[in-house]
Interface confidence: low
């Protein structure tokens, strides 16, 4: 329904905190290099000509999109083409122009200092003295380095924070009660950011098919007794959200999300059994919780998928009728039978059933042709169960930090030409699977590992895709979404890639490696071992681990060292000559 | 190497009350999320409760809920849940679980398990 001023209508529909707070947000995704101060003031421009608007809806320019009115109030910033460079040239455009080029220059990787955390007491200092600043300090920093963070979720979130220092600001032993729940958003937040990553370069890249594919499998698998219209409808609003989300109009998708949850609530009984507790929490907690609930049971007796999909002799008559709801009911009873299949596996099987139709039903006896067709699921379904357990083996063996590095070494001589920074970044994040999924029953490995695996292979694919260098990298990100991983999977050594230089200040190491967090030291262990294996691609598992003792031995003894830094210069030449001749190089 | 230790199992009649703790070693114990879980016999693992690692967040089972509490003391490493107005259809394996994450999903999301405490609800 249309609305006089569509600014009003939001900021009415949102109340003034969820507007300040989403405008604060989209401005700092858009504009990630621009001063705090500065998009403060933006947004109380902003806020306060809403407020005129709702007072008067007739009002001058309370008519224009909100496109329209956040664009020209970005484009008055001074320092634009300066700070910005040719992002600048999106403000000669006219909407919707501008604002897809705005989109286009979102920065998944700005060059951006990383956050250091202060002491507790001058956090809640900071807190006590102006905590409105103080949160919304928090949603500008963790919106400029995730430029395609859930919105309505980093509401969530700060909500969150919030709750953390008016506990533990007043509590006996502040940084006890305080980093853990600290850590605990961080952590939650980064995987937070990473899953919402996805389902944007899912709409972007692949279109809105290809998202309303993977969101049919997985509220099918989640809501397993819901009707196919049910799932059908949720799907239609949760694709409108991201959409919105993705395509920074944060305003309409917080409003639209909080729409839906009210839907799912008041219609739980006709979609999950798992809903009520949900449904009693306030809205940024309800709408959390029913994204992260669990899955539904599955109905008893549901009938074998053969007879409608491969025995029936209408298959092709129905499939001509309507192609897209043929196969959306046929990916709903797919994956309502199957919470122990990845959604990305669900995808692959519903892509080799839409194949098969194709060729099929234009064959001269089409049931024929399409009779075998459940057989053709048996390898698809068995690579990723094979991978896991052979990972998972690996994992159990070898511990969560050199199973990264065994993944390390292996995507490193996969693709060695990306930035080193990323093939850590990507490879410690891969490791994490062991951990996160290995431990559970064989029924629940593959919807954790290999959905996992996704989120992460699109955080390579976002950082690749800013500055490409590896055509097998392009190839695997571009090709198919569902197939990313077993095209990673499938690429063998880069016979083409011509080794690195040996640089010998890549390996000199200095003192300030002793203060470093165990998490650190491990990064630059790591960072040194991609590099060996940049020098010496075809160097073998056992030489790689003898360099990587060696200088583990070489870091403890210069740490335990009287005099640090003058160890560290003359133990490291030794390191590198032995590392050089244990290596051939 | 990661253990979660329960203790505090036991018998007890219908309508009274046990307290369960997990003892963790080998990882950081702030750092996980803890849940507890059970399984009667020839039944299903369920979820029962969950609690955030800070502790500011907890889930309960429908089934548990005004009767069981979770708390955890991250000084001592330790999670406990106290069982009141206990029903013979408590009677299962309770198990202790962390998880990375905060976990308001699946038990696939949980990293690390104990072996399990019997708790038997029977007059």
């Known amino acids: 329904d249309a609305h006089k001023s569509e600014v009003a209508h939001r900021f009415k529909d949102l109340g003034e905190e969820n507007f300040k707070a989403l405008v604060l947000i989209a401005f700092a995704q858009y504009l990630q290099q621009c001063p705090f101060e500065d998009h403060v003031k933006l947004v109380n421009e902003v806020t306060e000509f809403a407020k005129t608007c709702v007072a008067d809806e007739s009002a001058e320019n309370c008519d224009k999109s909100l496109h329209t009115l956040f664009g020209d109030k970005l484009c008055t910033v001074a320092t634009l083409r300066e700070t910005y460079g040719e992002m600048a040239d999106c403000c000669a455009k006219q909407e919707p122009e501008r604002n897809e080029c705005f989109l286009q220059h979102k920065d998944d990787n700005p060059n951006l200092p990383r956050l250091v955390r202060p002491e507790v007491d001058v956090m809640c200092t900071a807190f006590h003295d102006n905590e409105e600043t103080f949160l919304k300090k928090y949603l500008y920093e963790i919106a400029r380095r995730h430029p395609y963070f859930y919105a309505p979720e980093l509401l969530f979130f700060a909500k969150r924070y919030k709750a953390a220092f008016t506990e533990c600001c007043q509590a006996a032993d502040k940084a006890a009660c305080l980093l853990p729940k600290l850590d605990e958003l961080r952590d939650e937040g980064k995987a937070s950011s990473a899953k919402q990553r996805l389902k944007c370069a899912s709409l972007q890249k692949f279109g809105e098919r290809a998202f309303k594919a993977w969101a049919v499998a997985r509220l099918s698998q989640r809501f397993p007794k819901a009707e196919f219209a049910e799932v059908s409808k949720l799907v239609t609003d949760l694709t409108k959200v991201h959409t919105e989300c993705c395509h920074g109009d944060l305003l309409e998708c917080a409003d639209d999300r909080a729409d839906l949850a009210k839907y799912i609530c008041e219609n739980q009984d006709s979609i999950s059994s798992k809903l009520k507790e949900c449904c009693e929490k306030p809205l940024l907690e309800k709408s959390h919780c029913i994204a992260e609930v669990e899955n539904d049971e599955m109905p008893a007796d549901l009938p074998s998928l053969a007879a409608d999909f491969v025995e029936s002799k209408d298959v092709c008559k129905n499939y001509a009728e309507a192609k897209d709801v043929f196969l959306g009911m046929f990916l709903y009873e797919y994956a309502r039978r199957h919470p122990d299949y990845s959604v990305v596996l669900l995808l692959r099987l519903a892509k080799t059933y839409e194949t098969t139709l194709e060729k099929c039903c234009a064959a001269a006896d089409p049931h024929e042709c399409y009779a075998k067709v459940f057989d053709e699921f048996k390898p698809l379904v068995e690579e990723p169960q094979n991978l896991i357990k052979q990972n998972c083996e690996l994992f159990e063996q070898l511990g969560e930090y050199k199973f990264q590095n065994a993944l390390l070494v292996r995507y490193t001589k996969k693709v060695p030409q990306v930035s080193t920074p990323t093939l850590v970044e990507v490879s410690r994040n891969l490791g994490k699977v062991g951990s996160k999924c290995c431990k559970h029953p064989e029924a629940k490995r593959m919807p954790c590992a290999e959905d996992y695996l996704s989120v992460v292979l699109n955080q390579l694919c976002v950082l690749h895709e800013k500055t490409p260098v590896s055509d097998r990298v392009t190839k695997c990100c571009t090709e198919s979404l569902v197939n990313r991983r077993p095209c990673f999977s499938a690429l063998e050594v880069d016979e083409t890639y011509v080794p690195k230089e040996f640089n010998a200040e890549t390996f000199t190491f200095h003192a300030d490696i002793c203060t470093l967090s165990e998490k650190e030291r491990q990064i630059k262990k790591q960072t040194a071992l991609v590099e060996l294996v940049k020098h010496k691609p075809k160097a073998t598992k056992e030489q790689l681990k003898a360099v990587m003792d060696d200088f583990a031995a070489f870091v403890e003894k210069c740490c335990k060292a009287d005099d640090k830094e003058t160890c560290f210069a003359e133990e490291g030449k030794k390191l590198v000559a032995a590392s050089q001749a244990a290596l051939g190089l | 190497e990661v253990q979660l230790v329960e203790s505090g199992g036991g018998v007890v009649q219908p309508g009274g009350s046990l307290r369960l703790s997990c003892a963790a070693s080998?990882?950081?114990?702030?750092?996980?999320?803890m849940g507890w879980f059970r399984q009667a016999p020839g039944k299903e693992r369920e979820r029962v409760v969950s609690?955030?690692?800070?502790?500011?967040?907890?889930y309960y089972a429908d089934s548990v809920k005004g009767r069981f509490t979770i708390s955890r003391d991250n000084s001592e490493n330790t999670v406990y849940l106290q069982m009141n107005s206990l029903r013979p259809e408590d009677t299962a394996t309770y198990y202790c679980?962390?998880?990375?994450?905060?976990?308001?999903?699946?038990?696939?999301?949980?990293?690390?398990w104990g072996q399990g405490t019997l708790v038997t609800v029977s007059s």
């Open positions: 679980a962390a998880a990375r994450y905060w976990a308001t999903g699946s038990e696939y999301e949980f990293d690390y």
């Open positions: 609690i955030s690692r800070g502790g500011g967040y907890t």
């Open positions: 080998g990882l950081t114990f702030s750092s996980y999320a």
